[in-house]
């Protein structure tokens, strides 16, 4: 029968001679050279050669366990004289013995990961994994230990699992957003002489709402003409928020001030500005200055950061109303006057009054629109608005006179107003009857 143990061969042999594997031997071998040993199978005749007389096997090349850990060969012992096998053909194994010739290799050259800013210490970030091609079943050649080469004191790595965690409290994205962490994986359980590999982990802190909006100035002033219709934008204010995305969204509101019902603030979603608009008609003559308190607040607040203070800020907005010169206003929309048809020239019929509505109360002068009184039957006192006749009247010619009176500001002739006057001529019995027959 065959006599051998399992053959073991150290990988990566660096000697100058062929590497001795072992000896095939049959108990039929009397040592007289009558037996011939033949090798077949994995690498026979190429990687492995056999001394056909002695049965000694040698390896002709450096072997790499990580390429092929086991070689299966077959052995034959033949009687040289008869050419017949003296043993049944038998399979045997050459097992390649591991040495620590492979460093750990990470599954990725570069990892990217994110973790929320302000996370608690020990918050999971990412897990890195390195594999070692050496034999995990023998020695520590494939026993990998992780350590952090760069990235302290911000991050730590669990030595056995490769799990990266936050290691520092209150890491603030607004202060620093990007971190580059270098992780080492070392075999031999991390002991001296172990082989190592490294990977880079790019960690980005993601935003949380830990910053309130802040107005860059405490006071704003805008001016607007009193003629601005409701909806008119009169100014923009902008609070800044160091956060990003929805955490930086701002809503504006008017919280206090005399202009609470006179103005609105709307949020421009594009620019995150507050637009102050006119809500009700303004009147310089009633109020010239409004002071508002405008608040900027985050609509999305994280309760755990409320201890940092209120997530809002306020500013004072002073709105100054500009005077717009307005034309005089008559005391009535129309005047109806009466006069007897027998009235003498210069008879006063009545009067009109108009007043400058502006605070300055500019004096007003009156005149008759001559297009409406071509015959110049009526006149007006330019100072007090008294209407009087300048010609004799005849009811039988015209029963009603419709004229227009103009009021003009003396200091500003561009500002004028018009009002209709309806003058009724009253009948006086001044005509004898005509066309009547008198019967006897």
């Amino acid at each position: 029968s065959w006599m051998w143990n399992q053959f073991f061969l150290l990988e990566e042999y660096t000697g100058s001679d062929y590497q001795y594997v072992g000896k095939l031997h049959s108990d039929q071998d009397r040592g007289d050279g009558s037996l011939k040993y033949i090798l077949s199978g994995d690498g026979a005749g190429d990687l492995f050669i056999i001394n056909e007389n002695t049965g000694d096997i040698q390896a002709t090349k450096r072997l790499d366990r990580e390429e092929k850990p086991v070689y299966i060969l077959r052995a034959q012992a033949i009687n040289r004289r008869t050419g017949r096998p003296v043993e049944p053909e038998s399979e045997f194994i050459i097992k390649i013995h591991d040495i620590n010739d492979n460093e750990p290799i990470f599954t990725k050259e570069v990892y990217t990961a994110t973790v929320p800013e302000m996370s608690d210490v020990g918050t999971f970030v990412v897990q890195v994994t390195a594999t070692d091609a050496d034999d995990p079943t023998y020695g520590n050649s494939a026993k990998v230990v992780y350590s952090i080469l760069q990235g302290q004191p911000y991050f730590s790595v669990e030595s056995e699992t490769g799990i990266i965690k936050t290691a520092l409290l209150n890491m603030d994205r607004e202060n620093r957003e990007q971190y580059q962490v270098v992780i080492q994986a070392k075999d031999m359980g991390g002991q001296m002489g172990g082989l190592s590999g490294t990977t880079t982990v790019n960690i980005t802190l993601t935003d949380v709402n830990d910053n309130p909006p802040r107005f860059p100035q405490s006071t704003y002033q805008f001016k607007t003409p009193e003629s601005s219709p409701p909806g008119t934008p009169i100014g923009r204010i902008k609070a800044s928020d160091a956060d990003v995305g929805e955490n930086a969204e701002i809503e504006y509101s008017i919280t206090d001030g005399e202009g609470l019902d006179m103005f609105d603030v709307i949020t421009d979603q594009e620019t995150q500005e507050g637009i102050i608009t006119v809500k009700k008609l303004l009147d310089f003559e009633k109020k010239k200055v409004y002071t508002l308190k405008v608040e900027a607040s985050n609509p999305y607040v994280e309760p755990r950061f409320l201890y940092l203070g209120p997530f809002k800020d306020s500013a004072t907005v002073r709105i100054v109303v500009e005077d717009v010169d307005e034309p005089p206003v008559f005391s009535k929309l129309a005047y109806i006057l009466q006069i007897r048809e027998d009235a003498q020239i210069n008879t006063t019929i009545g009067s009109v009054t108009a007043q400058d509505p502006d605070a300055a109360r500019n004096p007003v002068k009156y005149s008759v629109d001559r297009h409406t009184d071509m015959d110049r039957i009526f006149n007006i006192d330019s100072g007090n608005g008294s209407i009087f006749t300048s010609k004799l009247l005849d009811r039988e010619t015209l029963l009603w006179h419709n004229i227009t009176v103009i009021a003009t500001e003396i200091n500003n002739p561009k500002q004028s107003s018009r009002v209709p006057l309806y003058i009724k001529v009253l009948d006086v019995n001044d005509n004898a009857p005509t066309g009547l027959s008198t019967g006897a």
């Epitope: 860059p216 002073r318 605070a359």
Partner: antibody, heavy 122, light 106 residues
Framework: EVQLVQSGAEVKKPGASVKVSCKAS????????MHWVRQAPGQGLEWMGW????????EYNQKFQGRVTITADRSTSTAYMELSSLRSEDTAVYFC???????????????WGQGTLVTVSS | DIQMTQSPSSLSASVGDRVTITCKAS??????LAWYQQKLGEGPKLLIY???TLQTGVPSRFSGSGSGTDFTLTISSLQPEDFATYYC????????FGQGTKVEIK
């Protein structure tokens, strides 16, 4: 030309009131804001309030709210500033100053009165 | 409220000197700034408005510059009648004055 002429110096006891006048000429009195500014001895200038003589509307510095009253008499083109509950720290020169704009309550002061010294002393 | 800080508080100079006075606002006031000159026993006199516009009748040796929060008044060649106290004033929102700069004869 525009002129603002103020009333003469006053000496008052603590707790009393003082009324300083400012007569305007050379422009339409009702069309410009009239401001009052004070200056304590060796100190800077401090804005107190304004009046729009056209309709009598006023605005006061919060610091003086409740103690200061500014009025105007359109018939004589005169503005008045009355300060009540006087204390020693109210000792100052009080100036009237014309606001540059007629149409809105803003802007700088283009003409000033000569000032009225008010001394508060017991 | 907006605060105005003027510097220096006083300076000594000779006739013909170039003098620069600065004024700093506690927040952006754009160009809403005026400079006044005040002589002893008189009311202030407007020199410059809107930060850099010379008031009518004021000599051209006076000039103003700046916007936002930092402003300067420059007297290019000091004259005997220029020895006085100078004030800056913001009128962006309400009214506030600097504490003044006294220009004295060296």
């Amino acid at each position: 030309e525009v002129q603002l002429v103020q009333s003469g110096a006053e000496v008052k006891k603590p707790g009393a009131s003082v009324k300083v006048s400012c007569k305007a000429s050379g422009y339409t009195f009702t069309r410009n804001f009239m401001h009052w500014v004070r200056q304590a001895p060796g100190q800077g200038l401090e804005w107190m309030g304004w009046i729009y003589p056209g309709d009598g509307e006023t605005e006061y510095n919060q610091k003086f709210q409740g103690r200061v009253t500014i009025t105007a008499d359109r018939s004589t083109s005169t503005a008045y500033m009355e300060l009540s509950s006087l204390r020693s720290e109210d000792t100052a020169v009080y100036f009237c100053a014309r606001g540059v704009y007629g149409g809105f309550a803003g802007g700088y002061f283009d003409f000033w009165g000569q000032g009225t010294l008010v001394t508060v002393s017991s | 409220d907006i605060q105005m800080t003027q510097s220096p508080s006083s300076l000594s100079a000779s006739v013909g000197d170039r003098v620069t006075i600065t004024c700093k606002a506690s927040q952006n006031i754009y160009k809403n700034l005026a400079w006044y000159q005040q002589k002893l026993g008189e009311g202030p006199k407007l020199l410059i408005y809107d930060a850099n516009t010379l008031q009518t009748g004021v000599p051209s040796r006076f000039s103003g510059s700046g916007s936002g929060t930092d402003f300067t008044l420059t007297i290019s060649s000091l004259q005997p009648e220029d020895f006085a106290t100078y004030y800056c004033q913001q009128y962006y929102s309400g009214w506030a004055f600097g504490q003044g700069t006294k220009v004295e004869i060296k």
